[in-house]
Interface confidence: medium
C-alpha cells in the first residue's frame, strides 16, 4: 500500500522535518503550510487549522514562500540619477539601477544605494578603463603619437594623422595639422588632388624639457578654458 499523504497541519514523525513549502510551528508543534510569494501569514496554524494567508498590501511584497506576519515594504522610489529596472509588485521589491553615464558607487543587496556620475577625461588624456555599472572611468595620459581633444567618459587616445607636409605638429591634446599643397595636375577636368594622410601614425613633438627633472617622454597638457590653480605642464 502507498504511504498515506499527510495534510497540513500534521505532527511530523520524530526526527523528521516538514516537507517543502511547509514550516514547523513551535507553538502548535505541527507542520503547517507556508504562504506563497505575494502573500503573508494572516493567522498562524493551530493543531486543528492550517495557516491562513493573505495577499500583500500595496507597496509591500514577499519574494519567497514564507510565514511572516507582515509583508516587507518596497524600497523608496528611485532617485533622479537612477532608473527603475524592476517595479515593486506583491512578489518582488523595486530595483533601482544607475542611469546611463552614471555608475554605482555604493551598492546594496539588489540594485544601487548611491549613484555617481562617470568621470570624464580631459583633453590630453584618454579612457584607460571604461566605466561599468559598478566602477568609474580611469583616465591615462595620451602617449607620444596619440591625442585626445575632448572631455569625455568614453573617448580613447587616437593616433595622430601623418602628413606629407606638417603645418602644426600634433601633441597630446591636438591632432597634427597637414599643410595644404598646391593642386597637382588633374586627372580629369575639374578634379583637384587634396593632400591625404598617408598613414595613421605621426611623429610626436616634445615640449622643451625642464632642466634636471624631464623624463624621457613629456606631454603637452592643455590649459583649457579654466586652467587649474597650479601650472599644468608635463615635466
Amino acid at each position: 500500500l502507498p504511504a498515506q499523504v499527510a495534510f497540513t497541519p500534521y505532527a511530523p514523525e520524530p526526527g523528521s522535518t516538514c516537507r517543502l513549502r511547509e514550516y514547523y510551528d513551535q507553538t502548535a508543534q505541527m507542520c503547517c503550510s507556508k504562504c506563497s510569494p505575494g502573500q503573508h501569514a494572516k493567522v498562524f496554524c493551530t493543531k486543528t487549522s492550517d495557516t491562513v494567508c493573505d495577499s500583500c498590501e500595496d507597496s509591500t511584497y514577499t519574494q519567497l514562500w514564507n510565514w511572516v506576519p507582515e509583508c516587507l515594504s518596497c524600497g523608496s522610489r528611485c532617485s533622479s540619477d537612477q532608473v527603475e529596472t524592476q517595479a515593486c509588485t506583491r512578489e518582488q521589491n523595486r530595483i533601482c539601477t544607475c542611469r546611463p553615464g552614471w555608475y554605482c558607487a555604493l551598492s546594496k543587496q539588489e540594485g544601487c544605494r548611491l549613484c555617481a556620475p562617470l568621470r570624464k577625461c580631459r583633453p590630453g588624456f584618454g579612457v584607460a578603463r571604461p566605466g561599468t555599472e559598478t566602477s568609474d572611468v580611469v583616465c591615462k595620459p595620451c602617449a607620444p603619437g596619440t591625442f585626445s581633444n575632448t572631455t569625455s567618459s568614453t573617448d580613447i587616445c587616437r593616433p595622430h594623422q601623418i602628413c606629407n607636409v606638417v603645418a602644426i605638429p600634433g601633441n597630446a591634446s591636438m591632432d597634427a595639422v597637414c599643410t595644404s599643397t598646391s593642386p597637382t595636375r588633374s586627372m580629369a577636368p575639374g578634379a583637384v588632388h587634396l593632400p591625404q594622410p598617408v598613414s595613421t601614425r605621426s611623429q610626436h613633438t616634445q615640449p622643451t624639457p625642464e632642466p634636471s627633472t624631464a623624463p624621457s617622454t613629456s606631454f603637452l597638457l592643455p590649459m583649457g578654458p579654466s586652467p587649474p590653480a597650479e601650472g599644468s605642464t608635463g615635466d
Partner: nanobody, 126 residues
C-alpha cells in the same frame, strides 16, 4: 578601495629637505595615477605632483618645479615625494591621493569616491 598612509613629515628650516612616503594597500591595481596634494592653513587644497605608473608622464605644480621630485617603488606599492630647498610657503598638510582629479587627467576635482590618505604635516620655518 585603496588605503593610503603617509609618513615622513616634520619640521625643517628653510632650505632643508624632507622625503614623504605613501604606502598603498587594497585595490592598488585601479590606481594608475598617484599624486601629492597639500593644504596650507586657510587655503584650498592644491595639486603638487603626480605620476602615471608605467609611463614617463609626470606633473609638477609651477611652485615646486626643480625642487620636488615624485617617484614610485612599484614593488613596495609606495609613492615618494622628495622635497629639496624647502620654503616657508611649502608649509601645510601633505596628502597622498590615488587616481584623483584634474592633475590625473579628470575634468574636475570633486569626486568623493577616490582614495586619500590622512595627511602628514610639513612645517618650514625661516
Amino acid at each position: 578601495q585603496v588605503q593610503l598612509v603617509e609618513s615622513g613629515g616634520g619640521s625643517v628650516q628653510a632650505g632643508g629637505s624632507l622625503r614623504l612616503s605613501c604606502a598603498a594597500s587594497g585595490h592598488t591595481y585601479r590606481s594608475n595615477c598617484m599624486g601629492w596634494f597639500r593644504q596650507a592653513p586657510g587655503k584650498e587644497r592644491e595639486g603638487v605632483a603626480a605620476m602615471y605608473t608605467g609611463t614617463d608622464w609626470k606633473y609638477y605644480a609651477d611652485s615646486v618645479k626643480g625642487r620636488f621630485t615624485i617617484s614610485q617603488d612599484k614593488a613596495k606599492n609606495t609613492l615618494y615625494l622628495v622635497m629639496n630647498n624647502l620654503k616657508p610657503d611649502d608649509t601645510g598638510v601633505y596628502y597622498c591621493a590615488a587616481d584623483f582629479g584634474f592633475i590625473c587627467g579628470y575634468d574636475s576635482d570633486d569626486d568623493p569616491y577616490d582614495a586619500w590618505g590622512q595627511g602628514t604635516q610639513v612645517t618650514v620655518s625661516s
